[in-house]
Interface confidence: low
C-alpha cells in the first residue's frame, strides 16, 4: 500500500502565438480544479477505461476573473497535493492522466458549468520511494508543470511497496519473533497487518486482514462490548447488589452493521452508518464503483475500478450527501433581495422579483417613474438607477404626501419675513433689501417698499 502524490506547479497559456488569454468563457469568473487518474501499465488504453490504480480530485482553486487587455498569467491554483492512495503493489509502469477542469461561477441553467479545459496523458516508469519526478506537458494551447512521486505507507516498503517491514527498534535485533527484512538490514519484518479499523485495544490478528476480539468484546472491529451476564433483570439499573446497568436486548447489540459500519439506536430500531462503498440496512451491499454511476445531479465520481475500493462524489452547487443525492435548500440563505421570492430549481437558484425590482437577486431597483406616484403635484426624477420625487412647495417625504412648511428652511434673506401661500411662499423684505428672497440690497438713492402681506397669508416668525 502507498500513495501517489502529484504537485501542480503551474497551469497557463503555453508559449507562442494563439495562446489563450483566459480560461474563463465570456460569461464571467471561473476557477480551476484538477483530476488525476492512474492506470497500470504502459499500453495504449481507451480514455474511458477505469482508473484502476485510483483517482483523485483537487480542491477548487481561487476565483479567476479575466483582466481585459492583460496577458493571461499562470492561473491561480488550488492548494495542496493531489494524493491517490493505492492499496496493492505499485506497478512501476503506469499511465498518468491529468485533467484541468473549469468551473464557471455565473448563474447556470441546466446544471453545473464544469468543462474540461485540458488533458495530458503520460506513460511513465517510476519506482516507489524515489525522488519527485518533474515534468512539463502541453495540451493544446495550455502548458502544465508538475511533479510526482510514489511512496509506500508503513509498514510497506520497497520499490513496489510489497514487503511488510518496519524500522528496527534496536541496532542488534528486531524484536521477538521478527526477522530482519532482507536485503535491508535496518528494517524488520512486520507482524501481520490486522483488518483496517480493528481496535488496537480490544482486537488482535494472526493473519493479515483479520480482526479477532479479546474476551468481552465483539463486532467486526472489536469495538462493541459484550453484554455483561452478571447483571440480571430489566433494561436499566439492576435490582441486584452489583448495581450495574444491563444493556439488555438493544437493537445495536452485537453490532448488526457489517463491513465496519457503525450502529446507532433509533426509536425501536437501529441505523447503520456505512463506510464509503457499502450500502444497505446493515451495510451488506458492496461493490459499488464509479462505473455504476453512483454520483447524482452532475456529481463527479472519483475512485478506483476495484469493487472494494472507495469512490468519492464531488457535488455541484446545490447538492450534498455522499452521492450528491440531497438537494440543498439554498433558499434558506435568503439570497433574493427586496422581498423577492426564491426558487431553488435544483440546477440553479432563481429569484422572482417584486414589481419594480430586477436582476438575478432582485438587487436592481428599476422603478422608472412609470408606476411611481408623486402626490400633490410632485414630479418623479430618475438618475443613476434610482428615482425620487421632487415635491411641490409645501410638500415633502418619499411620495410628497407629507405637508411641509415652506418657511422652515428660512428662505428670506437679510431678516425678511416669510409668508406661506398655497402657490409657494412670499418674502416681506426688511428695509434696504428687495427681490423674491430679499437677496438684493436697495441702492442708496432707491426707494424700498415693504409689500403688504397678501390677504389669506399667515405671517411666519421674522427670520433672524
Amino acid at each position: 500500500a502507498g500513495v501517489f502524490e502529484l504537485q501542480i506547479h503551474s497551469f497557463g497559456p503555453g508559449p507562442g502565438p494563439g495562446a489563450p488569454r483566459s480560461p474563463c468563457s465570456a460569461r464571467g469568473p471561473c476557477r480551476l480544479f484538477f483530476r488525476v487518474c492512474l492506470k497500470p501499465g504502459l499500453s495504449e488504453e481507451a480514455a474511458e477505461s477505469p482508473c484502476a490504480l485510483g483517482a483523485a480530485l483537487s480542491a477548487r482553486g481561487p476565483v479567476y476573473t479575466e483582466q481585459p487587455e492583460a496577458p493571461a498569467p499562470d492561473l491561480p491554483l488550488p492548494n495542496g497535493l493531489l494524493q491517490v492512495p493505492f492499496r496493492d503493489a505499485w506497478p512501476g509502469t503506469f499511465s498518468l492522466i491529468i485533467e484541468t477542469w473549469r468551473e464557471e461561477l455565473g448563474d447556470q441553467i441546466g446544471g453545473p458549468a464544469w468543462s474540461l479545459l485540458a488533458r495530458v496523458t503520460r506513460r511513465r516508469r517510476l519506482a516507489a520511494g524515489g525522488p519527485w519526478a518533474r515534468d512539463i506537458q502541453r495540451a493544446g494551447a495550455w502548458e502544465l508543470r508538475f511533479s510526482y512521486r510514489a511512496r509506500c505507507e508503513l509498514p510497506a516498503v520497497g520499490t513496489a511497496c510489497t514487503r511488510l517491514c518496519r524500522p528496527r527498534s534496536a541496532p542488534s535485533r528486531c524484536g521477538p519473533g521478527l526477522r530482519p527484512c532482507a536485503p535491508l538490514e535496518d528494517e524488520c519484518e512486520a507482524p501481520p497487518v490486522c483488518r483496517a479499523g480493528c481496535s488496537l485495544e480490544h482486537g488482535f490478528c494472526e493473519q493479515p486482514g483479520e480482526c479477532r476480539c479479546l474476551e468481552g468484546w465483539t463486532g467486526p472491529l472489536c469495538m462493541v462490548p459484550v453484554s455483561t451476564s452478571s447483571c440480571l433483570g430489566l433494561r436499566g439499573p439492576s435490582s441486584t447488589t452489583t448495581g450495574c446497568l444491563v444493556p439488555g436486548p438493544g437493537p445495536c447489540d452485537g453490532n448488526p452493521c457489517a463491513n465496519g459500519g457503525s450502529c446507532s439506536e433509533t426509536p425501536g430500531s437501529f441505523e447503520c452508518t456505512c463506510p464509503r462503498g457499502f450500502y444497505g440496512l446493515r451495510c451488506e451491499v458492496s461493490g459499488v464503483t464509479c462505473a455504476d454511476g453512483p454520483c447524482f445531479n452532475g456529481g463527479l465520481c472519483v475512485g478506483g475500478a476495484d469493487p472494494d475500493s472507495a469512490y468519492i462524489c464531488h457535488c455541484p452547487p446545490g447538492f450534498q450527501g455522499s452521492n450528491c443525492e440531497k438537494r440543498v435548500d439554498r433558499c434558506s440563505l435568503q439570497p433574493c433581495r427586496n422581498g423577492g421570492l426564491c426558487l431553488d430549481l435544483g440546477h440553479a437558484l432563481r429569484c422572482r422579483c417584486r414589481a419594480g425590482f430586477a436582476g438575478p437577486r432582485c438587487e436592481h431597483d428599476l422603478d422608472d417613474c412609470a408606476g411611481r406616484a408623486c402626490a400633490n403635484g410632485g414630479t418623479c426624477v430618475e438618475g443613476g438607477g434610482a428615482h425620487r420625487c421632487s415635491c411641490a412647495l409645501g410638500f415633502g417625504g418619499r411620495n410628497c404626501r407629507e405637508r411641509a412648511d415652506p418657511c422652515a428652511a428660512r428662505p428670506c434673506a437679510h431678516g425678511g419675513r416669510c409668508y406661506a401661500h398655497f402657490s409657494g411662499l412670499v418674502c416681506a423684505c426688511a428695509p434696504g433689501y428687495m427681490g423674491a428672497r430679499c437677496e438684493f440690497p436697495v441702492h442708496p438713492d432707491g426707494v424700498s417698499a415693504l409689500p403688504a402681506a397678501p390677504p389669506g397669508l399667515r405671517p411666519g416668525d421674522p427670520q433672524r
Epitope: G111, V288, F296, H347
Partner: antibody, heavy 122, light 107 residues
Amino acid sequence: QVQLVQSGAEVKKPGASVKVSCKASGYTFISYWITWVRQAPGQGLEWMGDIYPGSGSTTNYNEKFKSRVTMTRDTSTSTVYMELSSLRSEDTAVYYCARETTVGGAYAMDYWGQGTLVTVSS
Amino acid sequence: EIVLTQSPATLSLSPGERATLSCRASQSINNNLHWYQQKPGQAPRLLIKYVSQSISGIPARFSGSGSGTDFTLTISSLEPEDFAVYYCQQTNSWPLTFGGGTKLEIK
C-alpha cells in the same frame, strides 16, 4: 434490461393502510431516484413523491400526501416501498413506481412499473 | 404549484395526418418539460424529455418544441399505434405536476 415489477392489486377498507412494493432489476439500484405517481380511474397522473435508494432517508413528498405517505427501500432486495395510510375512497387508483432520469437536477421518468390497483371500499 | 393546461382535451385525426398537441404552464418552467404517452391499461411511456430531447427507442415522428410557458408535441404523420392519451409534465419546481392530458383518437 431495466425492469420495475410492482406488487399485486389490493382491496382496503377506509382508514386502513396499504404498502405497495416495486422491485428493480437490470441497473444499479442505488443509483437512480424512484418516484411514485398515481392515477385515479379515468383521471390524469398525480406525483406523490420520490426516494433516493442510496440513502433511504432522502425523500421528497408532495405536500398533499406528506402526512400519510412513507417511502422506504431495501437495498438487499433492490425494492422500494410506498405506504399510504388513513385510506379514503378517493385514494382508489393505480399506483405506479418509475425510475427517474437525472439531468441537471430535474427529473423525467424513463422506466415505469406495471402499476398496482388499490381499491378503497367499505 | 405550477398548473399545466393541455389543449385540446380531445383531438380527432386520421392516420397519416399531422398532430399538434399543446401544453401551457401557469408560469415559466424553463426547459423542464417532458411528454408521455399512455395507452389503456398500460403505464405511461416517456416520449420527449426537456422540451425537445429525443428518447432512445421512440420513433423520430415525435418531436417537441417551445420554451418558457408554451410547449408543443408534434407527431409528423400519425400511425395507428399513436392513438392514446398524451401527458406533459414539469420538473421545474415542487411539487412535480402533470397536465390533464390530451386524448388523441381516430377520426
